[in-house]
Interface confidence: medium
């Protein structure tokens, strides 16, 4: 079986205040089994984005049905993009553990930059 | 293992079109990017682009932006490139791969090649 | 796009010796996550290019161990520790960082 990649095709995307940002990540692999979560930054001090098990994330849609079988698409949408959501974006491929699921591989991310409105 | 096996050598006149396929067998394909490479004789490896079928969506090199056209089929594992307005300058073995930008593993498997003559 | 240059261009080589190709790119390959996007590839005579090396430093399924990659940032090296009869043949370095993929010029080792 091959080694699991995580892929974050672009290196950085770029939206206009008020727009909807697509940040694309995919999985070569089913294994191992664990959840898939986005995080903005890095490091101890990074931020939840999007948690596929579990949590509320009302400005966020799956591009594709994660419950789908099979399905390795676990690209984002984020809503009503303000200059607050600049950064860069990590998908990060958790395996299922007990009890905390462990970090298993990180994308190499995607810079979310904010274009100012048109007026 | 995943192999990848392309389509048959093609000898095309200039200011015509070349496709040439790659089936993947043996893994996953959805999510892997294949990307295209040629080499023309005695020269070195020249990236031209790349889709991952599982977007749809594919990525070229400035240079071939507008001339080449890489497309998958899901359905069958098999991805496709197509070089329009050939000169003999594109006379070249074209090789798929699996790989991606920005990729943790490199392009591990690669197909056999095709040749690809333009001559008139 | 990112310009990778190679050295030498032709490495001629005694077997049981040791070689070592240099590979340096116009901007860092150096990724915030840690990782240099560079990897080394082997094409034989007659045959299709086959990975050696990824990420720099991390050898490819089934190369023998014979294979090093090392350095960071803009300036890589490919090490041979004792050059076999069947390493001939051209290396490549590629970038993976980012889009469009750019390889080296290659160099071609040959058997003294």
């Known amino acids: 079986e091959d080694e699991l990649q995580v892929i974050q095709p672009e290196k950085s995307v770029s939206v206009a205040a008020g727009e909807s940002a697509t940040l694309r990540c995919a999985m070569t692999s089913l294994i191992p089994v664990g959840p898939i979560m986005w995080f903005r930054g890095a490091g101890a001090g990074r931020e939840l984005i999007y948690n596929q098990k579990e949590g509320h994330f009302p400005r966020v849609t799956t591009v594709s049905e994660l419950t789908k079988r099979n399905n390795l698409d676990f690209s984002i949408s984020i809503s009503n993009i303000t200059p607050a959501d600049a950064g860069t974006y990590y998908c990060v491929k958790f395996r299922k553990g007990s009890p905390d699921d462990v970090e298993f591989k990180s994308g190499a991310g995607t810079e979310l930059s904010v274009r100012a409105k048109p007026s | 293992q995943v192999q990848l096996v392309q389509s048959g050598a093609e000898v095309k006149k200039p200011g015509s079109s070349v496709k040439v396929s790659c089936k993947a067998s043996?893994?996953?394909?959805?999510?892997?990017?294949i990307s295209w490479v040629r080499q023309a004789p005695g020269q070195g490896l020249e990236w031209m682009g790349g889709i991952i079928p599982i977007f749809g969506t594919a990525n070229y090199a400035q240079k071939f932006q507008g001339r080449v056209t890489i497309t998958a089929d899901e359905s069958t594992s098999t991805a496709y490139m197509e070089l329009s307005s050939l000169r003999s300058e594109d006379t070249a073995v074209y090789y798929c791969?699996?790989?991606?930008?920005?990729?943790?593993?490199?392009?591990?498997?690669w197909g056999q090649g095709t040749t690809v003559t333009v001559s008139s | 796009d990112i310009v990778m240059t190679q050295s030498p261009l032709s490495l001629p080589v005694t077997p049981g010796e040791p070689a070592s190709i240099s590979c340096r790119s116009s901007q860092s390959l150096l990724h915030s996550n840690g990782y240099n996007y560079l990897d080394w590839y082997l094409q034989k005579p007659g045959q299709s290019p086959q990975l050696l090396i990824y990420l720099g430093s991390n050898r490819a399924s089934g190369v023998p161990d014979r294979f090093s990659g090392s350095g960071s940032g803009t300036d890589f090296t490919l090490k041979i520790s004792r050059v076999e009869a069947e390493d001939v043949g051209v290396y490549y370095c590629?970038?993976?960082?980012?889009?469009?993929?750019?390889f080296g010029g290659g160099t071609k080792v040959e058997i003294k």
């Open positions: 791969a699996r790989g991606v930008p920005r990729g943790d593993l490199g392009m591990d498997v």
């Open positions: 590629m970038q993976a960082i980012e889009s469009p993929l750019t």
């Open positions: 043996g893994g996953t394909f959805s999510s892997y990017a």
